[in-house]
């Protein structure tokens, strides 16, 4: 058998297979050796006794969208059944005091892979022999703590396959240079060592994608916005929009990157070298935000030039291989190509709450002594869209234990003026964050206010 | 001068439903909150829910939580309170109040009767 | 059974003084403001006393409202016959997050 028939149906064309070779990769017409590495296909009776207790479940993610020249990342993580886990010599064991369907286990390894590599090992002097070899028959990799790794993964995408030994948790890197754009499928499947040979455990799938196009996404965060992520905002306050591009392999570290936006509120064009930027949007309604972030990023060089018709027919000076106008192509060229990330929202802006002031605090007079507690009344005053809701939240005076957290319904008058009353349990220094709400904004302020003894004669105030 | 005017009143059978409506004059709608409060035959004064000027807020009470539902029309100053799975125990006058802390102005009821 | 607790009755005789008192707790009458309603016979409520203390215009001065921690009490002075009515108490609560009334008091004035 050939790994492609191993490996999956999802053969790509003849271009493919002769054009985007992946660095280390290697051909999936090489041949499987199926003495080591049954195969089974799904729905085979044997996956269900693959692994003692259970099925491993292998998860496969990857830091895709990639942009066409960086690198993708893809990991394997192994699931293994409840109570199981990889010790730190690469064996599986069972997890102390930790029980499953089987109740507690009286060996403690799932598989001791040290006892089996120590008793079967019959090698030649090198700690090479016939069995640690991968499924193409390439020797496993001695690097230091090998025989700790006990699964081989092998990895499938494009018409070709990458191999590696690992333990219950690996990573690749691809760069994706020679990958078609668009979306493309990556297959893995696990084995694990038995005796000198391995059984498949797991196979799992995922899309990855690559791309000619910067991946941009924007925060955008507002003071006194109350839901940042429903893109409604508030008008009168400056929004400040925050790029994030996602570039995982860094591909783009030493680009400069130039940003340029249009806001859809007739402010015209913005230009800017920094990734956050804001604006103030002075009208209610909806925008149209557009952005486009621009990348200068290592990339093909262009084709040369054809070479100038010469007036009159000369002898050919040799086959074309020789033009000496081709020996620029060389490939080591570092040649730069302008990369483009799009980014567009909608955003609607509406009345909110722009501020909110305590302008007056007050100690309430009580017709009957009440030496526990002080009533305490706030005249708020604010600016901007009606408030539907108070909040006031009593804490130490370092703003950081909350005591009392009370929210209420509150009718404001035009003038948006309130008075929020408030019970203080006893004298002492409080911090109070006020809070006035509506459907869209949620506006803070703060004071630390001295509650005195309920002497008539200690006067209320504001500590600094 | 303030004015509520409550309406769509009526006999229902258990589970049925019925629309309240509320027209309100003599003040700027679309800056007030707007709350309904009813009153069982013989009974004391139930709050049943509040909305917030623009209708983005919007309160009930345990007892009509996911049958009862406030809204409001600003263009028309209207309030309403739609009354699905109705009951027995929904029987009351159904009053129309302005604002939610304090119930400043008060409609004259319109009487909801639930009855097989 | 209401979250605010009133005496479902109490009585005077005309220019006496009466209070009605209204007991809740730190999530309402304690940090929300209290206010009282009238309701005449066959009519709808009438709002007598808001934030507490404070009266709209058009309501007698013989109504008065107080609060005390946890307590709130509306005290009429100089009663009349036309007095006669339910009253009620009522405030928000921050915790069922819900406007709660008391049971309502019955006052009759005697003689």
């Known amino acids: 058998k050939r790994f492609h028939d191993v490996l999956g149906n999802e053969r790509p064309s003849a271009y493919m297979r002769e054009h985007n070779q992946l660095n280390g990769w290697s051909s999936d017409e090489n041949d499987w050796n199926e003495k080591l590495y049954p195969v089974w296909k799904r729905g085979d009776m044997r996956w269900k006794n693959s692994w003692k207790g259970g099925r491993v479940q292998a998860v496969l993610t990857s830091d895709s969208p990639a942009l066409v020249g960086s690198n993708i990342t893809f990991a394997v993580n192994l699931i293994f059944p409840r109570c199981q886990k990889e010790d730190a010599n690469g064996n599986i064991v069972y997890e102390k005091n930790c029980r499953n369907e089987a109740g507690l286990s009286a060996d403690p390894y799932v598989y001791n892979w040290t006892a089996w590599s120590e008793d079967s090992d019959g090698e030649n002097g090198t700690g090479q022999s016939h069995h640690n070899v991968f499924p193409d028959g390439k020797p496993f990799p001695h690097h230091p703590g090998w025989r700790r790794w006990n699964f081989i993964y092998v990895f499938h995408t494009l018409g070709q396959y990458f191999q590696k030994l690992g333990r219950c948790s690996v990573r690749v890197s691809v760069n994706t240079a020679n990958v078609t754009l668009g979306p493309q499928l990556m297959e893995v499947t696990v084995y694990r060592r038995h005796g000198r040979a391995y059984v498949p455990i797991a196979q799992v799938k995922d899309v990855y994608v690559v791309t000619d196009q910067i991946p941009v996404f924007v925060t955008m965060f507002q003071k006194n916005d109350r839901n940042s992520s429903d893109e409604t905002f508030l008008k009168d306050l400056p929004i400040m929009f925050d790029v994030l591009i996602h570039d995982p392999s860094h591909f783009l570290n030493y680009s400069t990157i130039n940003y340029k936006w249009s806001f859809g509120d007739n402010t015209g064009l913005f230009v800017s070298t920094n990734h956050t930027v804001n604006h103030t949007y002075v009208l209610n309604g909806t925008f149209s935000l557009n952005l486009t972030v621009k990348a200068a990023a290592p990339g093909p060089c262009p084709p040369p030039p054809p070479p100038p018709r010469p007036s009159k027919p000369t002898p050919s000076l040799g086959p074309a291989g020789d033009n000496p106008l081709e020996l620029s192509r060389i490939p080591d060229e570092n040649c730069q190509i302008n990369r483009y990330g799009h980014f567009q929202a909608t955003i609607t802006i509406v009345e909110g709450i722009l501020e909110v002031n305590i302008i007056q605090m007050t100690d309430v007079l009580m017709p009957v002594p009440w030496p526990e507690s002080s009533l305490i009344d706030f005249v708020v005053t604010c600016q901007g869209s009606i408030p539907t809701e108070v909040c006031t939240i009593i804490s130490d005076p370092t703003c950081e234990i909350t005591q009392n957290t009370v929210c209420s319904p509150v009718d404001v008058d035009e003038m948006c003026l309130l008075t929020v009353r408030r019970t203080f349990n006893g004298s002492g220094t409080y911090c109070v964050n006020l809070t006035l709400g509506d459907d869209t904004s949620l506006a803070l302020t703060s004071t630390l206010i001295s509650v005195p003894d309920r002497d008539p004669a200690s006067p209320l105030r504001m500590a600094n | 001068e303030v004015q509520l005017l409550e309406s769509g009143g009526g006999l229902v059978q258990p589970g049925g439903s019925l629309r309240l409506s509320c027209a309100a004059s003599?003040?700027?709608?679309?800056?007030?909150?707007m709350s309904w409060v009813r009153q069982a035959p013989g009974k004391g004064l139930e709050w049943v829910s509040s909305?917030?000027?623009?209708?983005?807020?919007?309160y009930y009470a345990d007892s009509v939580k996911g049958r009862f539902t406030i809204s409001r029309d600003n263009s028309k100053n209207t309030l309403y309170l739609q009354m699905n799975s109705l009951r027995a125990e929904d029987t009351a006058v159904y009053y129309c109040a302005r604002k939610w802390s304090t119930f400043d102005y008060w409609g004259q009821g319109t009487l909801v009767t639930v009855s097989s | 059974q209401s979250v605010l607790t009133q005496p479902p009755s109490a009585s005077g005789t005309p220019g006496q003084r009466v209070t009605i008192s209204c007991s809740g707790s730190s999530s309402n009458i304690g940090n929300n403001y209290v206010s009282w309603y009238q309701q005449l016979p066959g009519t709808a409520p009438k709002l007598l006393i808001y934030?507490?203390?404070q009266r709209p215009s058009g309501v007698p001065d013989r109504f008065s409202g107080s609060k005390s921690g946890t307590s709130a009490s509306l005290a009429i002075s100089g009663l009349r016959s036309e007095d006669e009515a339910d009253y009620y108490c009522?405030?928000?609560?921050?915790?069922?997050?819900?406007?709660?009334f008391g049971g309502g008091t019955k006052l009759t004035v005697l003689g």
């Open positions: 909305i917030s000027h623009s209708g983005g807020s919007k």
């Open positions: 009522g405030a928000w609560d921050s915790s069922l997050n819900a406007y709660v």
């Open positions: 934030a507490d203390s």
């Open positions: 003599g003040f700027t709608f679309i800056r007030r909150p």
